[in-house]
Interface confidence: low
Amino acid sequence: PEPPTACREKQYLINSQCCSLCQPGQKLVSDCTEFTETECLPCGESEFLDTWNRETHCHQHKYCDPNLGLRVQQKGTSETDTICTCEEGWHCTSEACESCVLHRSCSPGFGVKQIATGVSDTICEPCPVGFFSNVSSAFEKCHPWTSCETKDLVVQQAGTNKTDVVCGPQDRLRA
């Protein structure tokens, strides 16, 4: 268990006084004294404080700058910050989502293992034997080579990680 402290929860120690902290959404105007309570004021428009605090200034809500590819995912309140996310086709460059970059495309020979989200980039994987991707795409997975046998055809040209196999008719003379 935590050792006891001089003041109780939601209090802070100043000049030998246990003063009440200001509640989320409010900032400190003046410390308590023996004769007066802590004085707090609500945060202004576009400001917030998300904890019990003794801050003398509220924090500004985050600005979701469209020039950086950002848009508002959740509007801030006096107790919460604005949450930004990226425009469609873009993803955040950091956990704080301070700017966005275009989703990466997977080159030919690579397919999408995981489609990008607003916070994570596309994850690509090399197409294994039996699969190919002939396009640069942020959505396309590796496709399996065509099965010539199921079409009663034969492989005329082997597939690669970038190209499908080429099927052709069976050579009947060999039967």
């Epitope: 109780r8 000049n15 030998s16 246990c18 004769f35």
Partner: antibody, heavy 114, light 106 residues
């Protein structure tokens, strides 16, 4: 109104112990620390320590760490200070005072004499 | 430990005069508090947080100062003001008192 009423004067032998009480009324006992202050005859004031009655947290002046033990009983709104291994130099008036020091007990004279 | 030094040790003045008591701290403190003590009585809080008048204290008492130098002023002495005055700091543990200034009738 706020009142701090201390126990009566004590005469003690050197080497013995004494426990001084301070009964609080007129406010919520657990909301404020209780301090103890010493004043030797003809001398100034010395802070001994305090207790937070809400969780029994204590803080002592290092000078009194081995001399004084401060406790509190929430059920009776009473703070206590026990002084051990008494010597003639411990002869003094001992005061309790509520956090912020606006309210003081009347003082308890502890005389240590053989 | 912060040492508080009060001056003068004794101040002899007449009723109606102005009294200025000083308290110097060995290092900077946030606030200073002042008490009055009469013989056989507990100390009485006069001024807290350097300049705020405690409940029931007459307006002739005032406090000022910052950092290491603080002053208690009694604008016009009344007969009941003759007593010992202590400064007190609660900014740094251990909390300390000055040695006192005795204000006596001249």
């Amino acid at each position: 109104q706020v009142q701090l009423v201390q126990s009566g004067a004590e005469v003690k032998k050197p080497g013995s112990s004494v426990k001084v009480s301070c009964k609080a009324s007129g406010y919520t006992f657990t909301n404020y620390w209780m301090h103890w202050v010493r004043q030797a005859p003809g001398q100034g004031l010395e802070w001994i320590g305090y207790i937070n009655p809400s969780n029994d947290y204590t803080k002592y002046n290092q000078k009194f760490k081995d001399k004084a033990t401060i406790t509190a009983d929430e059920s009776t709104n009473t703070a206590y200070m026990e002084l051990s291994s008494l010597r003639s130099e411990d002869t003094a008036v001992y005061y309790c005072a509520r956090q912020g020091f606006p309210y003081w007990g009347q003082g308890t004279l502890v005389t240590v004499s053989s | 430990e912060i040492v508080l030094t009060q001056s003068p040790a004794t101040l002899s003045l007449s009723p109606g005069e102005r009294a200025t008591l000083s308290c110097s701290a060995s290092s900077s403190v946030s606030y200073m508090h002042w008490y009055q003590q009469k013989p056989g009585q507990a100390p009485r809080l006069l001024i807290y947080d350097t300049s705020k008048l405690a409940s029931g204290i007459p307006a002739r008492f005032s406090g000022s100062g910052s950092g290491t130098d603080f002053t208690l002023t009694i604008s016009s002495l009344e007969p009941e003001d003759f007593a010992v005055y202590y400064c007190h700091q609660l900014s740094s543990d251990p909390f300390t008192f000055g040695q006192g200034t005795k204000l006596e009738i001249k």
